[in-house]
Interface confidence: low
């Protein structure tokens, strides 16, 4: 239904706390360089205005669209051009072009320093002094670094953060209580961020149809007892929610997500038997819980997929009459039977099925042509299964750090032109797939591995788009989203690459490395490893291992030395010489 005042409607639906949080996230995602105080001031102004509209929907400007209201606020910021350059040009446009322009200027890799967590005591003091401001800072700092973070989900993580601080700040040993819990939230939030960015990429590059296909596959796996009409309704609603969030319409997105959660909880009987626990929770926890609810038990009496999609004499007729509906039912039926497949694989199979029908239904004898289609799925299924087995075996053998190094070597050889920091970030993230997925039961490994890798590779593509340097990467990134991961896996050493000349300073280290946290030490070592591969792209695994072992030994020796500086300055050049010899 139409509301006289959109802003009053959303304020009433969401309540003040969530309204303010979402407006703060929206502003932080659009203008990523502004300080918290600047955004907090704008948020307060917008909230005060919303309250006047709640009191009187006919008050001045209350009938304006949210894009108009928010855009006007952002465009009124002083010194916009000095701080944001050409983003200020957006302000010369009218809606909806102005909002589109803001979206295009979102920066996936803003030049902000990494988010550092303060000492436990300091955090607790600040949190106790002003919990609202503390949580506001959290929302602001995460949102500006992750401009596509799923806003209602970010409110959920802020709530988690809040609960952890409330609990741990009351304990004697705050540090040991906070650290593992906050690390857990951080890890989950980072994964949530790359997954959501993938959804927005799908929406931006390939439109709603592509996202809806993803949603149908995912929902069919989770709710195999729901009928096709129910799955279609859920997929349509979920597509709308994600479209709104990806488009910066965060108030509408959060409101519609709450509606979807309400609908699911009111219709459990036709959706899934596993929803009750989620539905007993308050709003943010409920929606989060529903988004990762366990798969319902598959119906026992499902007929073979071939009956309706290969053996039926009407296949081509059904396909011709309503292509999207017919393909949708195929995707639904195949996905509900295969919770053990990744969504990417299911979409590749659906694409293969569609291509087969397109070709065969134009021939003289269609059934003879498409009769073997299910057998033709086999290599498509085997490829990711082999990928999982190979990589999980390697992870179990090497551990997370060693596995990251193996991936780093592999990807530096595939795309040596890519900047070392990007390669290291990608390899570290790709390498985490082992810890995340390889410990799961067999039937959960494939969906976990492939869908996570796809999301990480999407980030690689986004960063590469900014400064394209590798034809290999451009080739894999310009195809469809579901083909990206197999494309990257299939890449081999880039034969066109001219090796980097050996620079001693790249491999020169100082005693300050000794005091770095373990993670930072690893990054330094991995940076050196990538540079070695760029110098010798065809170095064997044994050669690289020799050099890295030598390097680790050198660091260990010098960091334990009484006079560290002397050790680094005398042993460092020897290490460089040995490295050159080992790779010669």
């Amino acid at each position: 239904e139409a509301h006289k005042s959109e802003i009053a409607h959303r304020y009433n639906d969401l309540g003040e706390q969530h309204f303010k949080g979402l407006v703060l996230i929206a502003f932080s995602q659009y203008l990523q360089k502004c300080s918290y105080d600047e955004h907090a001031k704008l948020v307060q102004e917008v909230t005060d205005f919303a309250k006047t509209c709640v009191a009187d929907e006919s008050a001045a400007n209350c009938d304006k669209s949210l894009h108009t209201l928010f855009g006007d606020k952002l465009c009124a910021i002083p010194n916009l051009r000095e701080n944001y350059g050409e983003l200020a040009d957006c302000c010369t446009k009218q809606e909806p072009e102005r909002n589109e322009c803001f979206l295009q200027h979102k920066d996936d890799n803003p030049s902000l320093p990494p988010f550092e967590r303060p000492e436990a005591e300091a955090m607790c003091t600040s949190f106790k002094e002003n919990p609202t401001t503390f949580m506001g800072h959290y929302l602001h700092e995460v949102a500006r670094r992750h401009p596509y973070f799923y806003a209602p989900e970010l409110l959920y993580y802020a709530e988690q953060y809040n609960e952890i601080l409330t609990q741990c700040c009351a304990e004697a040993d705050k540090e040991s209580c906070l650290t593992p819990k906050l690390d857990g939230v951080k890890e989950k939030a980072l994964v949530s961020s790359v997954r959501q960015r993938m959804k927005c990429s799908s929406m931006q590059k390939f439109g709603e149809r592509a996202f809806k296909a993803w949603a149908v596959a995912r929902l069919s796996q989770t709710f195999p007892n729901a009928d096709f009409a129910e799955i279609t309704k859920l997929a349509t609603d979920l597509t709308k929610v994600n479209k709104e969030c990806c488009h910066g319409d965060l108030l509408e997105c959060a409101d519609d997500r709450a509606e979807l959660a309400k609908y699911m909880c009111e219709n459990q009987a036709t959706i899934s038997s596993k929803l009750q626990t989620c539905c007993d929770k308050p709003l943010l926890k409920k929606a989060h819980c529903l988004s990762e609810v366990e798969h319902d038990t598959m119906p026992a009496d499902l007929p073979a997929i071939a009956a309706d999609f290969v053996e039926d004499q009407e296949v081509c007729k059904n396909y011709a009459e309503a292509k999207d509906v017919f393909l949708g039912t195929f995707l639904y039926e195949y996905s509900r039977r295969h919770p053990d497949y990744s969504v990417s694989l299911l979409l590749r199979l659906a694409k293969k099925y569609e291509a087969t029908l397109e070709k065969c239904c134009a021939e003289a004898n269609p059934p003879a042509c498409y009769g073997t289609v299910l057998a033709e799925f086999q290599p498509l299924v085997e490829e990711p299964k082999n990928l999982v087995k190979t990589n999980c075996d390697l992870y179990e053998k090497l551990g997370e750090y060693g596995f990251q190094n193996a991936i780093l070597v592999r990807y530096t050889q595939k795309a040596p032109q890519v900047s070392t920091p990007t390669l290291v970030e990608a390899a570290r993230n790709l390498g985490r797939v082992g810890t995340k997925c390889c410990t799961l039961p067999e039937d959960q490994r494939l969906p976990c591995v492939e869908d996570y890798l796809s999301a990480i590779l999407n980030r690689v593509c986004l960063l590469h788009e900014k400064t394209p340097v590798s034809e290999h990467v451009t080739k894999c990134c310009s195809g469809s989203l579901v083909e990206r991961r197999p494309c990257f896996s299939a890449l081999t050493v880039d034969e066109t690459y001219v090796p980097k000349e050996f620079k001693a300073e790249t491999f020169t280290f100082h005693s300050d490395i000794c005091t770095l946290p373990e993670k930072e030490k690893q990054i330094k070592k991995q940076t050196a490893l990538a540079e070695l591969v760029k110098h010798k792209p065809k170095a064997t695994a044994e050669q690289l291992k020799t050099v890295m072992d030598d390097f680790a030994q050198f660091l260990d020796t010098c960091c334990k030395a009484a006079d560290k500086d002397t050790c680094f300055s005398t042993e460092g050049p020897n290490l460089v010489t040995r490295c050159k010899d080992a790779l010669a």
């Epitope: 550092e116 000492e119 600040s126 002094e129 800072h137």
Partner: nanobody
Framework: EVQLLESGGGLVQPGGSLRLSCAAS????????IGWFRQAPGKEREGVSC????????NYADSVKGRFTISRDNSKNTVYLQMNSLKPEDTAVYYC????????????????WGQGTQVTVSS
Amino acid sequence: EVQLLESGGGLVQPGGSLRLSCAASGFTLDYYAIGWFRQAPGKEREGVSCIASSGGSTNYADSVKGRFTISRDNSKNTVYLQMNSLKPEDTAVYYCAAAVLECRTVVRGYDYWGQGTQVTVSS
């Protein structure tokens, strides 16, 4: 009221040393990264050094590396900038600024600023 107050500036000969202090009142510094900036007459304000809230991460402008050291004493709610081997080109008004949690790459990223203290290096 939130305030940052710089002190310790003055006139010093080339090669000499000064220690600047940045004291916070009205809020606890534990939660903030503190950056030191300087502005010479007719020039833009430039970053000199910064220390993250945890104290674990520090950075320095190339022009002061090896000569300046930043440190913090949270119990005193104060951050220090030890300046050694001073040169005439270090002459400027020095400001400290606070930003939540970590150092920023742009001047605008800082939420609170002090009034500044003059440092003059001259023989």
